[in-house]
């Protein structure tokens, strides 16, 4: 995965965010997959930094060593500090594991910035507040990284919840929710609700703030609002999904469908931002220019490189519009849209220099590697990784960041023709030539 | 100019012991790999062990495995091979050679620049 | 392991001959191939990384070409001083790696 300010990535900061919450509505879904209503015990287990990625505990080996784990729906690997690091607190240490199994195998990730190699093996695996099980799992010891671990960040590992696909070295390692769904009884299902902080945290604040919650096996009631819409996965290697339509505060960017997916869409809880085409992300920002142009923002703000800044509590959320995107749905020609305010792609930021200021970057960019719908969109929604079922559930986050005048929503059906023609299908080309140099 | 120096060889019995040293210069010897290849009297190239560049991930031959341990001292500019249990089949000159980058276990890669070798006779 | 075999594993030409060596892998290994030289009692000295690319300072009449299992290293004008023998090395997976088992250019 991994992708431009891919990882990591911003984090869910306070639980439950200042704001106001929506009431609870009547579930209209029928029968989901799996476990229903309160997972109490999964609730409220992640955490996390901004910008830096939502973290849940885990522990590997015997006696278990507890780590802190990013949770990452845009990779495959579950790989762990595993050498000592000067951003890392504590890491896997296999010597002293009885139940540790070498692989004898080398694994080497490079992301767009910073990457990763360390040495294959499996291990068991549990997760203190998820489901009570204990699984052997594959596991990419991190020996090596540049530009990966962030300092401060308090996560040891990455979690990759995607499919076996896009596993390094390559989709014969088994990905580490493949291996909890075979040797348990747990649901082929998992659910993440993200709580974006909404206001800058200081250190202290940040590191006691709740994030927000994995639900493993299920979906559970209380972390949404109204009802779940699912759309397709459109092909299990990324959580890859189809936009039908995108919307500046209504208005369409009437651009061919299949521009939104070029060359994919993805739900990647491990990227901090919304990431446009280029085509798309120009069409996107002169409409949010317009929309706003009651202010006049630096062409660096646009672009992600500068902060703007208005006095504590006087942010003018109001001049900023909605962002629609309407996905594909689960009855032919039907779609459905999620709705994310200013709250949620304006990403708050501590800047030591104003601190009485409310401080913000915008977190929408541009990709050339497809859409990837990060933490920006997810903070706005309960999102359901339905692979049983092959789609993906949004519902509106009872946890979301709004004010008294908006709300993020989910709303459908819409009409909309011909969307499997909003699909790119990528050419199959021969590996890339990374060139390096070897030991 | 980047220069790698390799020393320790000599003759030693079967089941003993030596240490090589490969003293680096002229390039940020903790940004790259570095590997050990040998080469038997007569004979073709053998990769033996390598690396990486803060010396996290290391790897080696199964020929010489659990005999054989490769390490570095980035603050010294020093890679080194410890041998232990010498058979006869490890007489050869080994040389040490920098990786391009300090990763192990990247494609794409190459051995380049390599030192002048060091003998290791290993004999009754 | 992924296992590198060389052709010929000798050969003898005249100074200006084009000469032709080949270098096959077991598997595919893309383009990630590289060629070496070595001299009697000298340590080996890389001429070609990634198939094709010449490692700077090696002159031009040497190349590379292939992809996939079958790489070819060319010299197009043989010169008194490449007479050495040629090794191939694959670095598409990841350690251990090995060589082929050489080529022994020698004068005719």
């Known amino acids: 995965t991994h992708l431009g300010i891919r990882l990591p990535l911003r984090s869910g900061l306070a639980g439950p965010p200042l704001g106001l919450r929506l009431p609870r509505e009547t579930d209209e879904e029928s029968e989901e997959p799996g476990r229903r209503g309160s997972f109490v015990e999964m609730v409220d287990n992640l955490r996390g930094k901004s910008g830096q990625g939502y973290y849940v505990e885990m522990t590997v080996g015997s006696p278990p060593q507890t780590l802190n784990i990013l949770v990452d729906t845009g990779s495959s690997n579950f790989a762990v500090g595993a050498a000592p690091h000067p951003f890392l607190h504590r890491y896997y240490q296999r010597q002293l594991s009885s139940t540790y199994r070498d692989l004898r195998k080398g694994v080497y990730v490079p992301y767009t910035q910073g990457k990763w190699e360390g040495e294959l093996g499996t291990d068991l695996v549990s997760i203190p507040h998820g489901p009570n099980v204990t699984v052997r799992a594959n596991i990419a010891a991190i020996t090596e990284s540049d530009k990966f671990f962030i300092n401060g960040s308090n996560w040891e590992g990455i979690l990759g919840l995607a499919y076996a696909e896009i596993a390094r070295p390559d989709d014969s390692l088994e990905p580490f929710f493949d291996s909890l769904v075979k040797q348990t009884h747990i649901p082929n299902i998992f659910s993440l609700q993200l709580c974006g902080a909404g206001f800058p945290l200081n250190q202290t604040e940040a590191l006691a703030s709740v994030g927000g919650s994995m639900i493993i096996g299920g979906i559970d009631h209380s972390l949404y609002t109204g009802r779940l819409w699912y759309t397709p996965i459109r092909r299990e290697w990324y959580y890859e999904v189809i936009i039908v339509r995108v919307e500046i505060n209504g208005q369409d960017l009437k651009m061919d469908c299949k521009e939104y997916n070029y060359d994919k869409s993805i739900v990647d809880s491990g990227t901090t931002n919304l990431r446009l085409p280029k085509k798309v992300f120009e069409a996107a920002v002169k409409s949010i220019k317009a929309a706003s142009s009651t202010e006049k923002f630096p062409d660096g703000f646009w672009l992600g490189e500068q902060l703007v800044c208005w006095q504590a509590g006087t942010t003018p959320w109001n001049i900023f519009p909605v962002i629609s995107l309407y996905l594909m749905g689960e009855v032919t020609n039907q779609s459905f849209r999620i709705t994310i305010l200013p709250q949620q792609y304006l990403r708050p930021v501590e800047d030591v220099a104003t601190s009485q200021d409310d401080c913000y970057k915008f977190a929408v960019s541009q990709s050339s590697t497809g859409t990837v719908m990060g933490a920006v969109i997810m903070e706005g929604f309960y999102v359901v990784f339905d692979r049983a079922r092959k789609r993906i559930g949004f519902a509106v986050s009872a946890c979301h960041v709004h004010d008294e005048f908006r709300t993020a929503a989910v709303e459908g059906p819409f009409v909309t023709a011909d969307m499997e023609d909003c699909g790119y299908n990528i050419p199959q080309t021969d590996e890339s030539t990374l060139m390096t140099g070897r030991a | 100019e980047v220069q790698l120096l390799e020393s320790g060889g000599g003759l030693v019995q079967p089941g003993g012991s030596l240490r090589l040293s490969c003293a680096a210069s002229?390039?940020?010897?903790?940004?790259?790999?570095m590997s050990w290849v040998r080469q038997a009297p007569g004979k073709g190239l053998e990769w033996v062990s390598a690396?990486?560049?803060?010396?996290?991930?290391?790897y080696y031959a199964d020929s010489v495995k659990g005999r054989f341990t490769i390490s570095r001292d980035n603050s010294k500019n020093t890679l080194y091979l410890q041998m232990n249990s010498l058979r006869a089949e490890d007489t050869a000159v080994y040389y040490c050679?920098?990786?391009?980058?300090?990763?192990?276990?990247?494609?794409?890669?190459?051995?380049?620049?390599w030192g002048q070798g060091t003998l290791v006779t290993v004999s009754s | 392991d992924i296992q590198m075999t060389q052709s010929p594993s000798s050969l003898s030409a005249s100074v200006g001959d084009r000469v032709t060596i080949t270098c096959r892998a077991s598997?595919?290994?893309?383009?990630?191939l590289n060629w070496y030289q070595q001299k009697p009692g000298k340590a080996p000295k890389l001429l070609i990384y990634?198939?094709?690319s010449l490692q700077s300072g090696v002159p031009s009449r040497f190349s590379g070409s292939g992809s996939g299992t079958d790489f070819t290293l060319t010299i197009s004008s043989l010169q008194p001083e490449d007479f050495a023998t040629y090794y191939c090395?694959?670095?598409?997976?990841?350690?251990?790696?090995?060589f082929g088992g050489g080529t022994k250019v020698e004068i005719k």
């Open positions: 090395d694959e670095s598409y997976s990841t350690p251990p790696w090995t």
């Open positions: 002229g390039f940020t010897f903790s940004s790259y790999a």
């Open positions: 990634a198939a094709s």
């Open positions: 598997q595919s290994i893309s383009s990630y």
């Open positions: 690396i990486s560049g803060s010396g996290g991930s290391t």
């Open positions: 050679a920098k990786g391009g980058s300090q990763w192990l276990y990247a494609p794409g890669s190459w051995f380049d620049p």
